[in-house]
Each structure stands twice: as C-alpha cells, then as structure tokens.
C-alpha cells in the first residue's frame, strides 16, 4: 500500500531571464527512492538516479542544473518555460509517486511564490 505523499513548491512564478528551483519532497513512507525523473509535459528534463547520479537531457544542458538535493534549477528562463513540471519518484517497494508544479514565467518584475500543496 502506498502511504507516501509528495510535497511540492506548488504554483510558482519567476521573471524572464531569471532562475527558479523546482523542489519536491517525498514523506510519510519508508520506501527507498531509486530514481527521480523531472519532466515538462511529456519531455524529459533530467534524471537523478540513486546509484548513478544525474543525467540532464541534452536540449536543456545549458540551462538546467542538478539540485539542490533531488530538486532541479532552471536558468535563463523564457516565457516558453511556462507550464507544468512533474517530479516522478520511483520507489521500492511502493512504486511511483508523482508531484506537479506549475511555473509561470513573467515578463514583469512581479513574481511571487504560490502556496505549497500536496499530492497524495
């Protein structure tokens, strides 16, 4: 039975040209995290494998940095980066947990962080 929950940074906004940290945290489970995938819609951004380390997808290699922790740092943001991001936790023995973050990249200098929320 899957007892864990994923806490994410929720709905966030950032300025064009700036950077943002995407963070997820898995709690309420003793399952072992074997791999975390970061995806934007159906596109793979990065993989953090517990044994093998990080892989950054080539199309994002110049503006995605691994970390902090299992998170992901997006740099040189453009308006096209606006959209849904998913952290997909592969765990043993529980299985897969998915968290969702919505990022809005703003033209103006007004960029506020949204509230945190949980996805069971």
């Amino acid at each position: 039975m899957m007892t864990g929950t994923i806490e994410t940074t929720g709905n966030i906004s950032a300025e064009k040209g700036g950077s943002i940290i995407l963070q997820c945290h898995l709690s309420s489970t003793t399952a072992q995290v074997t791999q975390v995938n970061w995806e934007q819609q159906d596109q793979l951004l990065a993989i953090c494998n517990a044994d093998l380390g990080w892989h950054i997808s080539p199309s994002f290699k110049d503006r995605v940095a691994p970390g902090p922790g299992l998170g992901l740092t997006l740099q040189s943001l453009t308006v096209n980066d606006t959209g849904e991001y998913f952290c997909i936790y592969h765990t043993y023995p529980d299985g897969t947990y998915t968290g969702r973050i919505f990022l809005e990249v703003l033209e103006s200098s007004v960029a506020e962080h949204g509230a945190r929320f949980q996805i069971p």
Epitope: T34, N37, I47
Partner: antibody
Framework: EVQLVESGGGLVKPGGSLRLSCAAS????????MSWVRQAPGKGLEWVGR??????????DYAAPVKGRFTISRDDSKDTLYLLMNSLKTEDTAVYYC????????????WGQGTLVTVSS | SYELTQPPSVSVSPGQTASITCSGD??????GCWYQQKPGQSPILVIY???KRPSGIPERFSGSNSGNTATLTISGTQAMDEADYYC?????????FGGGTKLTVL
C-alpha cells in the same frame, strides 16, 4: 567490471528472422538505456535502435531502415537485452553490438565483441 | 533524416594536435560523443556528453560541441591514436553516427 556479450548471430536467408541476445554484467542493468549498433563489413557504425529503462517508460526508438522489422526488448530479471530481426534483407548483414547509452558518468563501459549476422541466399 | 558529416581523413604528425570535426544541424542541442575504432577491434567511447572522458581515456583527448559543430581534439598525438573516429549525436529520442574519419599519424 562492465561486460556485454552478444550472441545469436549466424547465416539467414533473405526474409528470414533471427533473435540476438546481449548478456550484461558488472552494472545495474535495469537502470541503463541500451542500444543496438551495427557495422556492415568495411563500413561505418550505424545505430539500430534503443530501449530506455523501465523507470523511463521502457520505450523503444528505431532507426528508419529497421523500423517495423526489428524489435528491441529487455529482461531486467536476467540482465539481458534482445533484438528480434524479421524480414531480413541482404543489407542487414553486419556485426551487431549492444551498447550502454552514455547517460551517466558512473555508467560508461566497453562494447562487446559483437555478433555477425549474414543475410544471404 | 538527421545527418552528421565528418571529413573522411585527417593526417597529423606525432606530438602535434589533431582536430576532427563533425557537423550537423543544431548539433549543439544534442550531446556529442566520439568513438575510436582500430582495425579488427570493437569501438571504444572516448568522449561523451560533449566533453566528458570515460575512465581510462587519456587526458590528451578532449571534446567540444556548439552550434552546428562538434570537435574531437587530440593533443600530443601518438602513433597509437591512429584509428577510425566516429562522432555520434545523442538525444532522448534518437541516435545518429557520422560516417567516420580515418586519423593517420604520419
């Protein structure tokens, strides 16, 4: 030590089928994205296709010349990669190598010796 | 279909620097990899993810990838570096090899 050993090659008639195997050892096979690459006699390297890890969907991608004829699969419980080749053509004659896709700094390794597939009537 | 272009041959004197280029549309948006193959042997990965060297590959091998061109550079080329070199464009959906370059150490 990372090791890949290909097998299953041989002589087959045009239109025939063959299944190649690749036994992997020395690394966590289930996390690896694996590709098949071939080399025709005296020619260059040609990518055949790949299969991603189950944790990345286990999906497959193929080069245009083999799409619809070749199928890549994996058995993570046996640390084995497969290539099923149907409707073989003379131009499929080559040494076939299985390889680890270079995703991770901690998982790059040598190629195997390959297995020769000869398609001839 | 995506294509990579390499010069068929490159010659270099021992101790000099050899540069082998690989060109393809927006190659810089993919990862560039390089393989060395000597006659009768299986290929060896010498550069991956544009500029990283696998363990056991000498420091004289280096790589770069930007725009439409990836480059393999061998500093202080040795006789043992004479081989065929293949570039590879790698991304999450497909892989393509170049036609290969024969490096001759004069």
């Amino acid at each position: 030590e990372v090791q890949l050993v290909e097998s299953g090659g041989g002589l087959v008639k045009p239109g025939g089928s063959l299944r190649l195997s690749c036994a992997a050892s020395g690394f966590t096979f289930s996390y690896a994205w694996m590709s098949w690459v071939r080399q025709a006699p005296g020619k260059g390297l040609e990518w055949v296709g790949r299969i991603k890890s189950k944790t990345n969907g286990g999906t497959t991608d193929y080069a245009a010349p083999v799409k619809g004829r070749f199928t890549i699969s994996r058995d993570d419980s046996k640390d084995t990669l497969y290539l099923l080749m149907n409707s073989l053509k003379t131009e499929d004659t080559a040494v076939y190598y299985c390889t680890i896709d270079p995703l991770y700094d901690l998982l790059t390794g040598p190629w195997g010796q390959g297995t020769l597939v000869t398609v001839s009537s | 279909s995506y294509e990579l272009t390499q010069p068929p041959s490159v010659s270099v004197s021992p101790g000099q620097t050899a540069s082998i280029t690989c060109s393809g549309d927006k190659l810089g948006d993919k990862y560039g990899c390089w393989y060395q193959q000597k006659p009768g042997q299986s290929p060896i990965l010498v550069i991956y993810q544009d500029s990283k060297r696998p363990s056991g590959i000498p420091e004289r091998f280096s790589g770069s990838n930007s725009g439409n061109t990836a480059t393999l550079t061998i500093s202080g080329t040795q006789a043992m570096d004479e081989a065929d070199y293949y570039c590879q464009a790698w991304d999450s959906s497909t892989v393509v090899f170049g036609g290969g370059t024969k490096l001759t150490v004069l």
